[in-house]
């Protein structure tokens, strides 16, 4: 049976040509995590695997960092990278579990971070 | 559409080797696990190993380590599996098949090729 | 020989609901979720079914479900009709020893 939960930054924003940390955690299971993917609708941003570390997409190594923890921060934002983020914690033995972030950046600066937490 | 699309069937003998490709379309390449998954006539699947161009991982099952090599060519989307010492327990269908999730974990396919039918007779 | 117990054949009238089981010991399919079903028409490639003990791709039909108890996975099928005719292969995967296979489940829709 699979306890764990995600949480994750939830609805954030950002001003165009800022960065952002995209952030998830995983709690209240005791599973092993083998590998998180940061997703971003249809293309994968990144991963990082127990064993072999942070590999990024070629086409995003400019623009993407992997860290702080297991989180990633998305750098030279453009309006563009408005949309849904996924976290996918692939868990042994639970399974896989997702977490979704919402961000829009804004032309504006006027950028309001939405709920936020420490990552201990 | 996304689809695998393997190479034709081969007619080999014992001792030698043979390489059968897969060509993968339709969606990006790399980010994608591949695994090679054979059936003897009347037989079950069997796994054999797998590659992760993402990574450039390879994994190939206990039984087929130092028979079996598996390579991917990011340039042309397409997944190879090479098997050497031939012998006629090797005659069956190979079929390449994605990973379901991104990233190479591998616990499940979605994706199949029809299969190529390696016959291996002297 | 594989690690993974599928019964050798199982059948039903159209309409009706089958299980097929899938055993195995408390160190593979007792000891995590990632289980999958494939089905295998005759001359054709696997088909993706059930993945990680119960969830269903997009295009499954709902007809297909998966759940497990202690080391048995099981795949049932309701409303029986005469396309599932086919054969069945449940696997298990472990990060150390990557995916096994059952030895596959023949169904007949009598």
């Known amino acids: 049976m699979m306890t764990g939960t995600i949480e994750t930054t939830g609805n954030i924003s950002a001003e165009k040509g800022g960065s952002i940390i995209l952030q998830c955690h995983l709690s209240s299971t005791t599973a092993q995590v083998t590998q998180v993917n940061w997703e971003q609708q249809d293309q994968l941003l990144a991963i990082c695997n127990a064993d072999l570390g942070w590999h990024i997409s070629p086409s995003f190594k400019d623009r993407v960092a992997p860290g702080p923890g297991l989180g990633l921060t998305l750098q030279s934002l453009t309006v563009n990278d408005t949309g849904e983020y996924f976290c996918i914690y692939h868990t042994y033995p639970d399974g896989t579990y997702t977490g979704r972030i919402f961000l829009e950046v804004l032309e504006s600066s006027v950028a309001e971070h939405g709920a936020r937490f420490q990552i201990p | 559409e996304v689809q695998l699309v393997q190479s034709g069937a081969e007619v080999k003998k014992p001792g030698s080797s043979v390489k059968v490709s897969c060509k993968a379309s339709?969606?990006?390449?790399?980010?994608?696990?591949i695994s090679w998954v054979r059936q003897a006539p009347g037989q079950g699947l069997e796994w054999m190993g797998g590659?992760?161009?993402?990574?450039?991982?390879?994994d190939v099952a206990e039984k087929f380590q130092g028979r079996v090599t598996i390579t991917a060519d990011k340039s042309t989307s397409t997944a190879y599996i090479e098997l050497s010492s031939l012998r006629s327990e090797d005659t069956a269908v190979y079929y390449c098949?994605?990973?379901?999730?991104?990233?190479?974990?591998?616990?499940?396919?979605?994706?199949w090729g029809r299969g190529t039918l390696v016959t291996v007779s002297s | 020989q594989s690690a993974l117990t599928q019964p050798r054949s199982v059948s039903g009238s159209p309409g009706q609901s089958v299980t097929i089981s899938c055993t195995g010991t408390s160190s593979d399919v007792g000891s995590h979720n990632y289980v999958s079903w494939y089905q295998q028409h005759p001359g054709k490639a696997p088909k993706l079914m059930i993945y990680?003990?119960?969830y269903r791709p997009s295009g499954v039909s709902n007809r297909f479900s998966g759940s497990k108890s202690g080391n048995t996975a099981s795949l049932t099928i309701s409303g029986l009709q005469a396309e599932d005719e086919a054969d069945y292969y449940c696997s298990s995967y472990t990060p150390s020893s990557a995916t096994v296979f059952g030895a596959g489940t023949k169904l007949t829709v009598l």
């Open positions: 098949a994605r990973d379901l999730r991104r990233g190479g974990v591998g616990d499940a396919f979605d994706i």
């Open positions: 990680e003990v119960s």
């Open positions: 339709g969606y990006t390449f790399a980010s994608y696990g």
């Open positions: 590659i992760t161009p993402f990574f450039n991982r390879v």
